[in-house]
């Protein structure tokens, strides 16, 4: 297993609809054809794999299970979007990238993006 640098933004604020997007960029040492991206959440004394996708370079990301994530890839960048977030989902979201094929296997883990989610205030009753 060889180490690889992964960069991601330090802070992202989710939209009022609970959607957060950020870019995960990795310094690929070679020409990987198969890449696996995992988003981990570290908060509340838990480490959770939020979503994971394996993709062939140039193709769409295919996420596993009932994923709350979507994403696209462009070169050594992965554009990730997490949906359905609520205030209690605020936490550190870490991007983990694995170059699966061809060998050698490379692993890179980012420092994490602190995603802040603020639940929208309910609209006040109107007389109009």
């Amino acid at each position: 297993c060889k180490a690889m640098h992964v960069a991601q933004p330090a802070v992202v604020l989710a939209s009022s609809r609970g959607i957060a997007s950020f870019v995960c960029e990795y310094a690929s040492p070679g020409k990987a054809t198969e890449v696996r991206v995992t988003v981990l959440r570290q908060a509340d004394s838990q480490v959770t794999e939020v979503c994971a996708a394996t993709y062939m370079m140039g193709n769409e990301l295919t996420f596993l299970d009932d994923s709350i994530c979507t994403g696209t890839s462009s070169g050594n960048q992965v554009n990730l979007t997490i949906q359905g977030l609520r205030a209690m989902d605020t936490g550190l979201y870490i991007c983990k990238v694995e170059l699966m094929y061809p060998p050698p296997y490379y692993l890179g883990i980012g420092n994490g993006t602190q995603i802040y989610v603020i639940d929208p205030e309910p609209c006040p009753d109107s007389d109009f």
Epitope: R41, A43, D44, Q46, T48, E49, V50, C51, A52, L64, D65, D66, S67, I68, I82, L85, M88, D89, G91, Y93
Partner: nanobody, 125 residues
Amino acid sequence: EVQLVESGGGLVQAGDSLRLSCAASGRTFSSYIMGWFRRAPGKEREFVAAISSSGALTSYADSVVGRFTISRDNAKKMVYLQMRSLKPEDTDVYYCAAARVPWSPRPSLSTYDYWGQGTQVTVSS
């Protein structure tokens, strides 16, 4: 409805390993998130680990990361908790639980609908 039966608990020495099993009944097992929780006498039930319906995604309490591994076999309707490098503070009753909800960044106790009876794990120093 899902019935859950845990097994594999026992008395071990600190540093030893143990594998807990949870047998589930019900035809829709593969659509449930499965989790392991633990509770010591007089304490709140505590999250240990969870696994998504397909087994692709997992979640762990910080206190067990790197020591415990959760896995599942949907064909056999089984969930496992492999526990390594056990510590006296791991002594607890361990419960298997099932939740029919989408995978979340924040698996929580309140989302679980079905619970087993528990299996005792005792780690002596």
